[in-house]
């Protein structure tokens, strides 16, 4: 066959669908690889061809569109399963071609099983809610295009295994689930089950997402440096190890990049010649506020090192702060036999 632009296996689009449920999968060529849409391609005389490779096989084979009840069908740039079966798992390829042009891409499709409480290997999207906010909503995801607007589906919401009814601050409102004054106890997996009729059959769509209640922007503050501070002096003798922790609290802020760094005499540690190491640890509160600790370490500190300026810096979307550590050379304790004796006038 003539040359074809092969975009390879698009593992970025690891598509997971539930067994025994409808699935509509758009050919990724038009969404991510080509600059024109399906309608334009079709008008230009290009044909979209689908084929697949079964799990643990190397052989590409055409998709059987002649199954009973049209279980697998194609509509424009969408491959339909009504419904999926476990052995539909594999790599699917869509190819757009005519006599002079060819472009194709493959993508993995995994059909997964779920238990009666909706647990499965499915990777779940995470929806963040702000703590104590008035009303926040999540929407049953990825159900567009499954049924026409004239069809009125029934939607049932679950938290974990339990149907949501008479939950105090969680209210089902059709495709939406409203949270009134969210608390951390609202954390968990929420599932919507959408049931709709089609050609005398009833189909179910199951969608689960994880809700995580996070710190509210109204409570957010600029970074707070807990250490170094004015109460602790790092007093060392030359040759000792100098350890200075920089501990910074960051309020949760959506999409904020939290940074902590040290400067020594105004320079980054990488830009100076002394042998310094920096170790970082990060911990999170239940509302995803973050505490970062960077420990600056000089194994054998010199007199010169003890005269330097060590400053901890922190930055978030809320602002930038800095704090200098108090470092000084320890005055050696007097040796009694010599110094004190001299002090008493002994010779």
């Amino acid at each position: 066959s003539e040359r074809c632009d092969d975009w390879g296996l698009d593992t970025m689009r690891q598509i997971q669908v539930f067994e025994d449920e409808p699935a509509r999968i758009k050919c990724p060529l038009f969404e991510h690889f080509l600059k024109f849409n399906y309608s334009t391609a079709h008008s230009a005389g290009l044909t979209l061809i689908w084929y697949w490779t079964r799990q643990d096989r190397d052989l590409e084979e055409p998709i059987n569109f002649r199954l009973p009840e049209n279980r697998i069908s194609k509509e424009k740039d969408v491959l339909w399963f009504r419904p999926t079966l476990l052995n539909d798992t594999g790599n699917y390829t869509c190819m757009l071609r005519n006599t002079t042009y060819c472009s194709k891409v493959a993508f993995p499709l995994e059909v997964v099983q779920k238990d009666s409480c909706f647990n499965s290997p499915m990777k779940l999207p995470v929806h963040k809610l702000y703590i104590e906010y008035g009303i926040q909503r999540i929407t049953c995801p990825n159900v567009d295009g499954y049924f026409p607007s004239s069809v009125k589906p029934t939607i049932t919401w679950y938290m974990g295994c339990y149907k949501i009814q008479n939950f105090n601050n969680v209210i089902p409102e059709g495709m939406n689930l409203s949270f009134l004054i969210a608390l951390i106890s609202n954390n968990g997996n929420y599932t919507c089950v959408v049931t709709y009729p089609e050609n005398g059959r009833t189909f179910h769509l199951t969608r689960t997402l994880t809700v995580k209640v996070v710190g509210s922007p109204k409570n957010a503050v600029p970074p707070v440096i807990h250490s170094p501070n004015d109460h602790v002096v790092y007093e060392k003798e030359p040759g000792e190890e100098l350890l200075i922790p920089c501990t910074v609290y960051f309020s949760f802020l959506m999409d904020s990049r939290n940074e902590v760094w040290w400067t020594i005499d105004g320079k980054k540690p990488d830009d100076i010649t002394i042998d310094v190491t920096i170790n970082e640890s990060i911990s999170h509160s239940r509302t995803e506020d973050e505490t970062r600790t960077q420990i600056l370490s000089i194994k054998k500190v010199t007199s010169e090192d003890l005269k330097r300026s060590y400053v901890c810096h922190a930055r978030s979307a809320k602002g930038e702060v800095a704090k200098a550590a108090k470092v000084k050379q320890k005055v050696p304790a007097p040796r009694y036999t010599v110094e004190l004796a001299c002090g008493f006038g002994a010779t």
Partner: antibody
Amino acid sequence: EVQLLESGGGLVQPGGSLRLSCAASGFTFAEYAMNWVRQAPGKGLEWVSAISYDGEGTLYADSVKGRFTISRDNSKNTLYLQMNSLRAEDTAVYYCARFRYYTAFDYWGQGTLVTVSS
Amino acid sequence: EIVMTQSPATLSVSPGERATLSCRASQSVSSNLAWYQQKPGQAPRLLIYGASTRATGIPARFSGSGSGTEFTLTISSLQSEDFAVYYCQQYNNWPWTFGQGTKVEIK
């Protein structure tokens, strides 16, 4: 200094209505969820209602749902409780209380007495 | 709704002695539990939040412990001003609920 001052209590007949107010000062009122908590004579504390800092989210105890409405006016630093269809069992001292998830009900008003009696 | 049960209903203690008050939740409330003190004719006053953190201005003789379903308020050495009713309250789940109270009286 944080202060919460309730008003509007009094004697009302069963089936009647009353509107309680709570004037807040000494803090940024618009940043806090606010609540009403009540205490019947000689009894314990009962949470009645909560409202989010922006006034959008409201929650009620089952015992008052459909009869009481909580609201707030952040421009006036004032919290309200509209009480309709009052019953004898609503007789209590009503407190307004400031709430933040991290510190619970950290400040309370001195309370206002509502008596429902014929 | 989560039911909070306090024990004992009344605790008779001599000044200077230690008082231990218990609070049990009908299901886990994590560490989202507060303790309040109420004296006759006064509003409740926050003592402890987050099960173990003392509120601003509360003396060190008050301490809280526990998590999940079992919580304790300890007053290490009772002063005359500590004789009052103490309430626990969960703020983990709506509706927020209080215990029925423990009255600490002079023995």
